[in-house]
């Protein structure tokens, strides 16, 4: 029974059974909708365009790490359509924060004006730091159904087939 | 074996009919949804209709609409385009292509089936 | 509707070249884009899909790159089977629209 299906899966009238919806590869995410027991026949997987990346699977692309804007680091790897960007060592003229507790954006470079005397990276110049920026990777699944409902991903597909 | 096999191409007099057959092998038809795209004499790709698996989705080229006909026997295997009103600028390589399941492109052609409209 | 350019309609190069067919949409297509070959006798085939990915059977040499409007098909070492027309293809937003096709020769 339809009802009896859940977030990503469909009603197969075939088998009468709930069958897992396709995922979608990695740098793709799904387009159109499938799961809660429906599953449109032309459900499928675009690529995610530029500047966002997806794991895979129920997944929708996710915009990259904004290294320099955001956190005022340095790019250590740019991201892809599969993976997202890596942040390097602060920027010039900013220090890390090393024992703050990380919120959801992980270590931010703070700016060497508001550092305490003595911040080993803005000692002397406002030369940049060689602490490793660790990575975040917040998780933040959306079903097909939501996203074909939402159109978060910015895809804007119409009546594609 | 051909995956995709076109037919039924010929001369046809302007304002004529003609049902072009796409007869599929080695897969499960029933799970792939199918195009149309043709090719006029020295020009390039042009896309004209689509029909989903299950024909519940059908979408045509403004170029077409209202004249030609996408269908699908599944229990045969085959595709179908029937055209009507046929015009010069209808002449062309017709191919059926297949897409791709879950993706959006053309992971198939057939050889394809030439139509010519003249009188 | 996407228009699909590709700006060189004939390009002639030696075997072993490394060759690129560029193409441009006009809307961002977000890596939606597709490249194929159709030999001489007319066979048509699939190369690359979704921009950078290679269609299982087709030669390494074959590479795509590419986002937003911009992209472009590179074949690495020309070999003389590569003589063909190649089309790109948006498959963002129907109507699907292709490349005016880019016709590769030997010199």
């Known amino acids: 029974e339809y009802s009896n299906c859940g977030e990503n899966e469909y009603y197969n009238q075939t088998t009468g059974l709930c069958q897992e919806c396709p995922p979608c590869g990695p740098g793709e995410e799904p387009y159109l909708s499938c799961g809660y027991g429906t599953k449109d026949e032309d459900y499928g997987c675009v690529p995610c365009p530029a500047e966002k990346f997806s794991k895979g699977g129920y997944q929708i692309c996710r915009r990259h790490k904004d290294c320099e804007g955001f956190f005022r680091a340095t790019v250590l790897t740019p991201g892809d359509m599969e993976n997202d960007a890596e942040c390097g060592p602060c920027l010039p003229g900013y220090y890390m924060l090393e024992n703050r507790p990380r919120n959801i954006y992980g270590m931010v470079c703070y700016s060497c004006l508001l550092a305490p005397p003595n911040t080993k990276e803005c000692v002397g110049a406002t030369s940049g730091a060689s602490a490793n920026f660790p990575g975040t990777s917040g998780s933040s699944t959306l079903s097909p159904f939501q996203h074909a409902h939402k159109e978060l991903s910015g895809q804007g597909h119409l009546a594609t087939a | 074996e051909v995956p995709l096999e076109e037919s039924g191409g010929g001369l046809v007099k302007p304002g004529g009919s003609r049902k072009l057959s796409c007869a599929a092998s080695?897969?499960?038809?029933?799970?792939?949804?199918m195009h149309w795209v043709r090719q006029a004499p020295e020009k390039g790709l042009e896309w004209v209709a689509y029909?989903?698996?299950?024909?519940?989705?059908?979408y045509y080229a403004d170029t077409v609409k209202g004249r030609f006909t996408i269908s699908r026997d599944n229990a045969k295997s085959t595709l179908f385009l029937q055209m009507t009103s046929l015009r010069s600028e209808d002449t062309a390589m017709y191919y059926c292509?297949?897409?791709?399941?879950?993706?959006?492109?053309?992971?198939?052609w057939g050889a394809g089936t030439t139509v010519t409209v003249s009188s | 509707d996407i228009q699909m350019t590709q700006s060189t309609s004939s390009l002639s190069a030696s075997l072993g070249d490394r060759v690129t067919i560029s193409c441009r949409a006009s809307?961002?297509?977000?890596?939606?884009l597709n490249w194929y070959q159709q030999r001489p006798d007319g066979t048509v085939k699939l190369l690359i899909y979704?921009?950078?990915r290679s269609q299982s059977g087709v030669p390494s040499r074959f590479s795509g790159s590419g986002s937003g409007t911009d992209y472009s098909l590179t074949i690495s070492n020309l070999e003389q089977e590569d003589v063909a027309t190649y089309f790109c293809?948006?498959?963002?937003?129907?109507?699907?629209?292709f490349g005016g096709g880019t016709k590769l020769e030997i010199k």
């Open positions: 979704y921009t950078s």
């Open positions: 293809h948006q498959g963002k937003t129907l109507p699907y629209t």
């Open positions: 029909i989903s698996s299950g024909s519940s989705a059908i």
């Open positions: 080695g897969f499960t038809f029933s799970d792939y949804g």
């Open positions: 809307q961002d297509i977000s890596n939606n």
């Open positions: 292509a297949r897409r791709e399941i879950l993706r959006y492109y053309f992971d198939v």
